[in-house]
């Protein structure tokens, strides 16, 4: 059918602290060795893992961008938590950057919601009370396949 690509990050440098996996898995704050025999601790402030796993390397800690504040630092079991600075927000559908909140509502509209790190100010029409985001709705595209006979593996 479809060949699916996965692109893991580069492996972090080997760690010293080791313990044995349980049921083939390593606890949060660790990753597994390639032979599956050892659990290796993540490096504090550099990488992390949040669940029991068999990752070959810990996940790289996020660095907060300029325009963001660090709410909590990266530990071996939790990624950095970043938040947009006051007056800016990040929407779930555009998480790559903090955008400036609007300073006011368009004519004929009233403000019913303040700027938060997660949302722009909210405006509604004075008469109807209908929300207005100022955004054009996005169209979601899905790729479908309609196979006939059983598919052979992709090369």
């Amino acid at each position: 059918i479809t060949q699916q690509d996965l692109a893991p990050q580069q492996r972090a440098a080997p760690q010293q602290k080791r313990s044995s996996p349980s049921e083939g898995l390593c606890p949060p704050g660790h990753h597994i060795s390639e032979d599956g025999r050892d659990c290796i601790s993540c490096k504090y402030g550099q990488d992390y893992s949040t669940h029991w796993n068999d990752l070959l390397f810990c996940l790289r800690c996020t660095r907060c961008d300029s325009g963001e504040v660090e709410l909590s630092p990266c530990t071996t079991t939790r990624n950095t938590v970043c938040q947009c600075e006051e007056g800016t927000f990040r929407e779930e559908d555009s998480p790559e950057m903090c955008r400036k909140c609007r300073t006011g509502c368009p004519r004929g509209m009233v403000k019913v919601g303040d700027c938060t790190p997660w949302s722009d100010i909210e405006c509604v029409h004075k008469e109807s009370g209908t929300k207005h985001s100022g955004e054009v709705p996005a169209v979601e595209e899905t790729v479908t396949s309609s196979p006939g006979t059983p598919a052979s593996p992709c090369s």
Partner: nanobody, 115 residues
Framework: VQAGDSLRLSCAAS????????VGWFRQTPGKEREFVAA????????YYADSVKGRFTISRDNAKNTVYMQMASLKPEDTAVYYC???????????????????WGQGTQVTVSS
């Protein structure tokens, strides 16, 4: 495909490695959470299946090709979903057989089974 037909999905790592020892498949239908389907340990070949697909689906691997396959037989209309290959499976407890999520995801492929 029609109910009762077979299909094979394949999943290849784009880099040198999948980034984890176990690789699996999840599926998702509109408005529902992704659900675990099957997983395989690429080192020793141990397999894990959701009850709903046991005996019908077979997960296998070709380490030389860095590829994992899922052979789906006796397909039912309720198998209709978007199927995702996943690596870096995440578990709440070491004894769990069913992962709660994954770190790396394929782009997904639609499987539609009509009656």
């Amino acid at each position: 495909v029609q109910a009762g037909d077979s299909l094979r999905l394949s999943c290849a790592a784009s880099g040198r490695t999948f980034g984890s020892i176990r690789v699996g498949w999840f599926r998702q239908t509109p408005g529902k959470e992704r659900e675990f389907v099957a997983a395989i340990n690429r080192n020793d070949g141990t397999t894990y299946y959701a009850d709903s697909v046991k005996g019908r689906f077979t997960i296998s691997r070709d380490n030389a090709k860095n590829t994992v396959y899922m052979q789906m037989a006796s397909l039912k209309p309720e198998d209709t979903a978007v199927y995702y290959c996943a690596a870096g499976l995440q578990y709440n407890r070491s004894a769990d057989r069913v992962p709660v999520g994954a770190v790396y995801w394929g782009q997904g492929t639609q499987v539609t089974v009509s009656s």
